[in-house]
């Protein structure tokens, strides 16, 4: 069964900057990736970025830089300030589509132990969900 992993990290140098990394563990080729965010339990969500292997990348504030890391993983830098700044209980979701096989989503948030003055571990445990 394909799976998606999500990592969320707060940057030590810029306290309002977050990095989201997502990847797809499966055999199919990726046709589209959508990154979204919102409050817990699905509240107030919206799309941050859409990455298409052929048509390119679209991103919306506060997303600053979305890019492909590999053919099956992406990263997104968020630069927040004020109302658009993510908080500790913000949920980030990545959904990978592999046409025509299907699509899979996983969500994650900043680890509760993250200290704003410290960077998260370099390789945090991925959060997996296969629906």
């Amino acid at each position: 069964t394909p799976e998606v992993w999500v990592q969320v990290r707060m940057e030590a140098t810029e306290l309002s900057s977050f990095t989201i990394r997502c990847g797809f563990l499966g055999s199919g080729s990726i046709s589209l990736v959508t990154v979204s965010w919102g409050g817990p339990n699905g509240a107030g969500g919206t799309t941050l970025a859409v990455l298409h292997p052929e048509r390119g990348i679209r991103q919306w504030a506060p997303a600053r830089q979305a890019r492909w890391e590999t053919q099956s993983s992406i990263s997104l830098i968020l630069e927040g300030s004020g109302a658009s700044s993510p908080c500790a209980n913000t949920t980030f979701c990545c959904k990978f589509a592999s046409f025509p096989e299907g699509s899979w989503e996983a969500c994650g948030s900043l680890p509760p132990s993250s200290d704003p003055g410290l960077s998260a571990p370099p390789t945090p445990a991925p959060i997996l969900r296969a629906d």
């Epitope: 589209l32 979204s36 799309t47 859409v50 298409h52 979701c93 589509a97 025509p100 989503e105 969500c107």
Partner: nanobody, 127 residues
Framework: EVQLVESGGGLVQPGGSLRLSCAAS????????MSWVRQAPGKGLEWVST????????SYVDSVKGRFTISRDNTKNTLYLQMNSLRAEDTAVYYC????????????????????WGQGTMVTVSS
């Protein structure tokens, strides 16, 4: 795995009405923009309508403006398309999809340009 399951299609006379539903599961439905697209027999995929994640913004192709209404219920993880004053040219397979096709342009639209897609429901408008 994400699932989008459409229902509500069928045979209707010109001038009639239908309400399509799309039940979503396996993802955080309320975080995503959703759209309806359709494919008429022998034709390419055509965008019909899009609604943003909180239902605050909707858009329609010109040919259905004033006749079709897109809506969603995030508490039920369901997308709807109310179709009134149906015409023969509305005959098509209607697909529920995640995403807004305007992100990359409406040219040469394909289901692979969306984040999720359903199996489609057939709408036939004929007397």
């Amino acid at each position: 795995e994400v699932q989008l399951v459409e229902s509500g299609g069928g045979l209707v006379q010109p001038g009639g009405s239908l309400r399509l539903s799309c039940a979503a599961s396996g993802f955080t439905f309320s975080y995503y923009d959703m759209s309806w697209v359709r494919q008429a027999p022998g034709k390419g995929l055509e965008w019909v309508s899009t609604i943003n994640s909180n239902a605050g913004r909707t858009s329609y192709v010109d040919s259905v403006k004033g006749r079709f209404t897109i809506s969603r219920d995030n508490t039920k993880n369901t997308l709807y398309l109310q179709m009134n004053s149906l015409r023969a040219e509305d005959t098509a397979v209607y697909y529920c999809v995640e995403g807004d096709p305007h992100n990359f342009g409406l040219e040469s639209l394909s289901l692979r340009d969306f984040g999720s897609w359903g199996q489609g429901t057939m709408v036939t408008v004929s007397s």
